[in-house]
Amino acid sequence: EEELQVIQPDKSVLVAAGETATLRCTATSLIPVGPIQWFRGAGPGRELIYNQKEGHFPRVTTVSDLTKRNNMDFSIRIGNITPADAGTYYCVKFRKGSPDDVEFKSGAGTELSVRAKPSAPVVSGPAARATPQHTVSFTCESHGFSPRDITLKWFKNGNELSDFQTNVDPVGESVSYSIHSTAKVVLTREDVHSQVICEVAHVTLQGDPLRGTANLSETIRVPPTLEVTQQPVRAENQVNVTCQVRKFYPQRLQLTWLENGNVSRTETASTVTENKDGTYNWMSWLLVNVSAHRDDVKLTCQVEHDGQPAVSKSHDLKVSAHPKEQGSNTAAENTGSNERNIY
C-alpha cells in the first residue's frame, strides 16, 4: 500500500483580523494509526495549535468529525484571528508509540497572513503653548496594522504639509506594525481656528483613510496688543482712561492698573469679545480722580496673559491742565471692544 502523505493544499491563506481562518489538511491513508496535530512553525520551538485528543484549544474547531471511521480530513478553523496568529502552520501525522507518539509525516505548511487595520491615529502637540512665527512639532501614532505598507499624510486646514518624518516599526518581519510621524508646523496669528490632520491609508481600510486631528487652539498663544487712551472728562476732577487689550488667545488674562507704580486695581478678563479669527478683545476702564493728585500721574496698564511675563503700556496724565481729550499715540487694530467700568 502507498505510504501516507499529508496534503496541505493551500500554500497561503489571507485573513482579516477578527475573522476565522480555515487551514486545510488531508491524509491519503488511515495507516499508520495515530493522531494528527497542528503546529505553528517548525523545529523544537514550534507551537502546538491543536491536538485532536487532549489539551485545551478553545479557538480551534475541526471542519469534519475526526472520530468518524475512515475520516481523512484534518482541516481546522481558528477563530478570532489576530496579527499574532500569523505564521506557517503544519499539519503533522503521528504514529502511536511508546513511551511517546512519534512524528510520522508533516504537510508542506500553510502560511497564514493576517490583515489588520491600523488603530485610529492619535495626534499630539507640544506640551507648552507657542506664539506665532514659531515652529512646533506634532506627532501622529497608529498601531497594530498588517501588512507593513502604509501611507501617512499631514494637512493643515486642508493643505498638505511637506515637512515631516515618518517611521514604521519594526523594520524587520513582525506580526503587526506601528507608524510614528512628526510634522513641523509654523504658527500664524490666524491659527486659533486651525486644525492639523494626520491621515493614514492602508489596504484594510478600502480607500477610506483614518484621520486624527489636533486643534491649534490647544497649541497657540497669541499675545495681546495694548492701547491706553484717555477719554473725555466725565465730571469735574474725573478722567476716564481705557486699556484696550486686543487680539489675544487663550482667554486667561489678568489686568492690573498702576498709578505712579502703585497698584490701583486688578481684574480678570471675563466678558470678552471674540474676533472672527478666534482671538479675543477686552477693554478695561479706570476712573481717575485728578483732584487727589498734585503732580502729573503715570497710569500703567499691566497685563499678564496665560501665565506669561507681564506686558504693559503707560499713559501720562497731566494734572496741571484738563483738556477734553488726550490720548496715547499707539497704533490699534480696527476691532470692536467690550466696555468694562471700574470705579
Partner: antibody
C-alpha cells in the same frame, strides 16, 4: 455542557481491588483521551495514566504500572480505572479528566483494615 | 520523567499584593504543554492557564503566565480574596505526565 460524573466513595481492605467509573456527557468519549489523577490526603496531584477510548490504547505512570488498568466503554461513554493490590498509601481522591481540561468531582477511596 | 518543582511551597500574602509563583522543570518543556490548575479545598482542580500564558475561560485578567524552557511563572498582579488556593503546574510534553507539588497561596 461537558460533564464528568464519577462513582461514589469506596472503602477497601488492603490487597483488594477497586474499580471507579467516570460517566461523561456533552461530548463523545472517543474524541478525547481520558486521564486519571490521584490526590492523597493533604498531598499534591499525581498522574496515573490515560486511555484513548477510540482504540483502547493506554499509557501509565511507572509508579502505577502493573497495578492499574484503565478501560473505556464507548457504548456507554464511561471510563474506568481499576487499582489492584491496594495498600494504605492508596487512600486518596481519584479524579478522571477529559483531555486535561475538564475534571470529574473525584472519588474517595479509603484503604483500611 | 520530567520533575516539576514549584516554589515557594507556601506563599503568605495580603489582598492587594502581587503574587509570583514559580515552576521549574528538570528538563525543557515546550511552552505549549505547560498548564496551571487552581484547586480549593474539597474541590476538583480547575484549568487556570493553558499553553503557559493563555487564561482559561472566565479567569480574571489579574492572572498572567509566562516562561519557556525550564522556568515558568504564574503571576497575580493584585490579590483578591478568592485567589487564595493551591496552584499546580503540569506538563504534558512527554510521558509520564507530571504535576508540580503545588504552591499554597494563603492569606497573611
Amino acid at each position: 455542557e461537558v460533564q464528568l460524573v464519577q462513582s461514589g466513595a469506596e472503602v477497601k481492605k488492603p490487597g483488594a481491588t477497586v474499580k471507579i467509573s467516570c460517566k461523561v456527557s456533552g461530548f463523545n468519549i472517543k474524541d478525547y483521551y481520558m486521564h486519571w489523577v490521584q490526590q492523597a490526603p493533604g498531598k499534591g496531584l499525581e498522574w496515573i495514566g490515560r486511555i484513548d477510548p477510540e482504540d483502547a490504547e493506554t499509557k501509565y505512570a511507572p509508579k502505577f504500572q502493573g497495578r492499574v488498568t484503565i478501560t473505556a466503554d464507548t457504548s456507554t461513554d464511561t471510563a474506568y480505572m481499576e487499582l489492584s493490590s491496594l495498600r494504605s498509601e492508596d487512600t486518596a481522591v481519584y479524579y478522571c479528566d477529559r483531555g486535561l481540561a475538564y475534571w470529574g468531582q473525584g472519588t474517595l477511596v479509603t484503604v483500611s483494615s | 520523567e520530567i520533575v516539576l518543582t514549584q516554589s515557594p511551597a507556601t506563599l503568605s500574602l495580603s489582598p492587594g499584593e502581587r503574587a509570583t509563583l514559580s515552576c521549574s522543570a528538570s528538563s525543557s518543556v515546550s511552552s505549549s504543554y505547560l498548564y496551571w490548575y487552581q484547586q480549593k479545598p474539597g474541590q476538583a482542580p480547575k484549568l487556570w492557564i493553558y499553553s503557559t500564558s493563555n487564561l482559561a475561560s472566565g479567569i480574571p485578567a489579574r492572572f498572567s503566565g509566562s516562561g519557556s524552557g525550564t522556568d515558568y511563572t504564574l503571576t497575580i498582579s493584585s490579590l483578591e480574596p478568592e485567589d487564595f488556593a493551591v496552584y499546580y503546574c503540569h506538563q504534558w510534553s512527554s510521558y509520564p505526565y507530571t504535576f508540580g507539588q503545588g504552591t499554597k497561596l494563603e492569606i497573611k
